[in-house]
Amino acid sequence: QRLPRMQEDSPLGGGSSGEDDPLGEEDLPSEEDSPREEDPPGEEDLPGEEDLPGEEDLPEVKPKSEEEGSLKLEDLPTVEAPGDPQEPQNNAHRDKEGDDQSHWRYGGDPPWPRVSPACAGRFQSPVDIRPQLAAFCPALRPLELLGFQLPPLPELRLRNNGHSVQLTLPPGLEMALGPGREYRALQLHLHWGAAGRPGSEHTVEGHRFPAEIHVVHLSTAFARVDEALGRPGGLAVLAAFLEEGPEENSAYEQLLSRLEEIAEEGSETQVPGLDISALLPSDFSRYFQYEGSLTTPPCAQGVIWTVFNQTVMLSAKQLHTLSDTLWGPGDSRLQLNFRATQPLNGRVIEASFPAGVDSSPRAAEPVQLNSCLAAGD
C-alpha cells in the first residue's frame, strides 16, 4: 500500500516481506509539528515515548572498570537519575529498583522532561515525514549490512521490558550508512498500537502505520553507549514500517511465536538466532534520513534516523499477536507504545531517492524544495 499522496511508483513496501514502498519524501517543520512531550490524549491515544535505552533499552552501560572498552549489547542505557550510583543497568524499566528515570510511561505522568531534560530538546524523534518536502540527496548510498544473518546458536535474549519487546543482538552485526559512517547493531525492538489503532512512531504525511521496527546501532567511534549518547551520529537507528499483508511473515514469526512466553512485564526468553536483515525491507537504497533523538527517555539527541521507504508486510494475525499479547506496568496491556511526532524545528529530512517528484522517465532533474547537505560532511 502506498502512503497518502505518495507518488505511484514509490512503493513503500515491496521489501523482503512483500512490503509496499510507502515513504515518499521528507518532512519539513510545520505548525502542527509544535513540540509535544507526549501524545496528547486524543491523538490516537498516542503513548508518550519509546523505549530505547532510551530507544528501548540500549545495551547495558558497564562501569568503566568492568569490561573496559566492551559493550554489553542488551538494554540501551537508561538515564542515570541524579545522585544515582553509576551501576550497570540491565534494562530500562527498573521501577522496582527505585531508579527515578525508569519511572516513565506512555501518555502519562511524569512529564518526560522531568525524567530527562533532553526530552524537551529541539531536535527530537519521531517526526512526520513529508516526502514532498524531503531533500533528495544522491550522496546517500544504499545501506550496507554485514553479519546480520545469525546462526541459530547462540540463542538471543527476547525481553518484555514493560515498554516494548526487545531482542538483544550479539557482537558482529555491522552496518554502514556510508563511507566512514560505520555502526554496530545493539538491539531491536518494536512499537505498535492496539486493535484497529495503528502504532508506528514515525508517520508519513500524517499517516500512522500499524507498527514499526527499530534496530539500534552504536557508532564504531565509541566503545560504549553512554559515551555516544547525545553525540552527533553516536547512535543510529534503522526504522521500518510494518503493514498488513496477505501472508504470514516467517522471519517475524520466529519472534512473534514466542511472545506468549514473555507476556509478563520484565520476563524474558531465549530465541534461536535468525536472519535479522529479513526483518527489514529488502530495498536498502531508498530511505529517509534525519538527525533526531531516542524516542524514549533519556531522549538523547544526535541520533541518525534512517527510515526505509519500503514497508514490511505481516499478516493480520501477526499484527494482532504483536499488539495483544504483552503486558506492561500496572496490569495494563502493553499497547500504543509510541511517542507523538515531534516538531522538525527547521530540520530537513533527506531522501536517498527523488521522493517528492514523479520519478517516471519523463521527469528530468526534479526540483526539490530543500537541498541536500552532503552526507557524512
Epitope: P152, L153, E155, Q270, V271, P272, L274, D275
Partner: antibody, heavy 124, light 107 residues
Framework: QVQLVQSGGGLVQPGRSLRLSCTAS????????MHWVRQAPGKGLEWVGF??????????QYSASVKGRFTISRDDSKTIAYLQMNSLKTEDTAVYYC???????????????WGQGTLVTVSS | DIQMTQSPSSLSASVGDRVTINCHVS??????LSWYQQKPGEAPKLLIY???NLHTGVPSRFSGSGSGTGFTLTIRSLQPEDYATYYC?????????FGQGTKLEIK
C-alpha cells in the same frame, strides 16, 4: 568414549507418570543442551524438547504435543538428564531417545550423540 | 512449524549405485539442516550437519548439498551397510522437525 545410557522405560497406564533417565559420560556434560526425541512404532522421529545448560539458565523448551505434561531437567553433578512424563496418553507410546545437541561451540542444533533408546508403552 | 518433506519416501537401489534423497523445507533455513541414518532397532546416527559438513567417522561417499529450502543427500557408491532409513532435520528453530524418512532398500 562419548555415550548416553538410558533407563526407566516400560509399560504404564494412560494418565499415569513415568520418569526416564539419561546418564552421560565421556564429554563435558555442562557444556551441552540435552534433548529428547521420540519415535512411535513404525513412524518417524519427533523432537520432544530440550533443556539448556547452566550458562543458558537451565531453561527448557518443549514441543506443543507434550508441553504442560512433560518436564525435562538435569543434574550436572551426576551428569544425568531426566524426562518426567505425566498424564501419559496412548499416543505417547514410543521409543524415547536422549540426545546431545547444541553447545557453546556449535552454531545450530544437530544431534551428534544418541542414547540407545528406551521403549515407553502407554496402554490400559 | 517448519515442515520437512522428503522424496522419495522409499527407493530401491543396487550396490555401487549413486543415490540421491531430497528434502524440501517449508521456509528458508539457510544451511541449518542435518541428515541422519537409522537402521532397524538402532538409534539414528548423524551423517551430515550444516547441509554439507561430513560428521566425524562418516564415509566420504556420503555428501550433502543445498541451502534455503532445498537440500540433497547423495550416496556416491552404495554399499551393503547403507541400506537404512534416512531423515533430514532442520535446526533453525524449534520445534525442531524431521522429514518423514526415506527408506533405502536393496534392489
Amino acid at each position: 568414549q562419548v555415550q548416553l545410557v538410558q533407563s526407566g522405560g516400560g509399560l504404564v497406564q494412560p494418565g499415569r507418570s513415568l520418569r526416564l533417565s539419561c546418564t552421560a559420560s565421556g564429554f563435558t556434560f555442562t557444556d551441552y543442551y540435552m534433548h529428547w526425541v521420540r519415535q512411535a512404532p513404525g513412524k518417524g522421529l519427533e523432537w520432544v524438547g530440550f533443556i539448556r545448560n547452566k550458562a543458558s539458565g537451565y531453561t527448557p523448551q518443549y514441543s506443543a504435543s507434550v508441553k504442560g505434561r512433560f518436564t525435562i531437567s538435569r543434574d550436572d553433578s551426576k551428569t544425568i538428564a531426566y524426562l518426567q512424563m505425566n498424564s501419559l496418553k496412548t499416543e505417547d507410546t514410543a521409543v524415547y531417545y536422549c540426545v546431545r545437541g547444541g553447545h557453546a561451540g556449535s552454531n545450530y542444533w544437530y544431534f551428534d550423540v544418541w542414547g540407545q533408546g528406551t521403549l515407553v508403552t502407554v496402554s490400559s | 512449524d517448519i515442515q520437512m518433506t522428503q522424496s522419495p519416501s522409499s527407493l530401491s537401489a543396487s550396490v555401487g549405485d549413486r543415490v540421491t534423497i531430497n528434502c524440501h523445507v517449508s521456509q528458508n533455513i539457510n544451511v541449518w539442516l542435518s541428515w541422519y541414518q537409522q537402521k532397524p532397532g538402532e538409534a539414528p546416527k548423524l551423517l551430515i550437519y550444516q547441509a554439507s559438513n561430513l560428521h566425524t567417522g562418516v564415509p566420504s561417499r556420503f555428501s550433502g548439498s543445498g541451502s534455503g529450502t532445498g537440500f540433497t543427500l547423495t550416496i556416491r557408491s552404495l554399499q551393503p551397510e547403507d541400506y537404512a532409513t534416512y531423515y533430514c532435520q532442520q535446526g533453525q528453530s524449534y520445534p525442531f522437525t524431521f522429514g518423514q524418512g526415506t527408506k533405502l532398500e536393496i534392489k
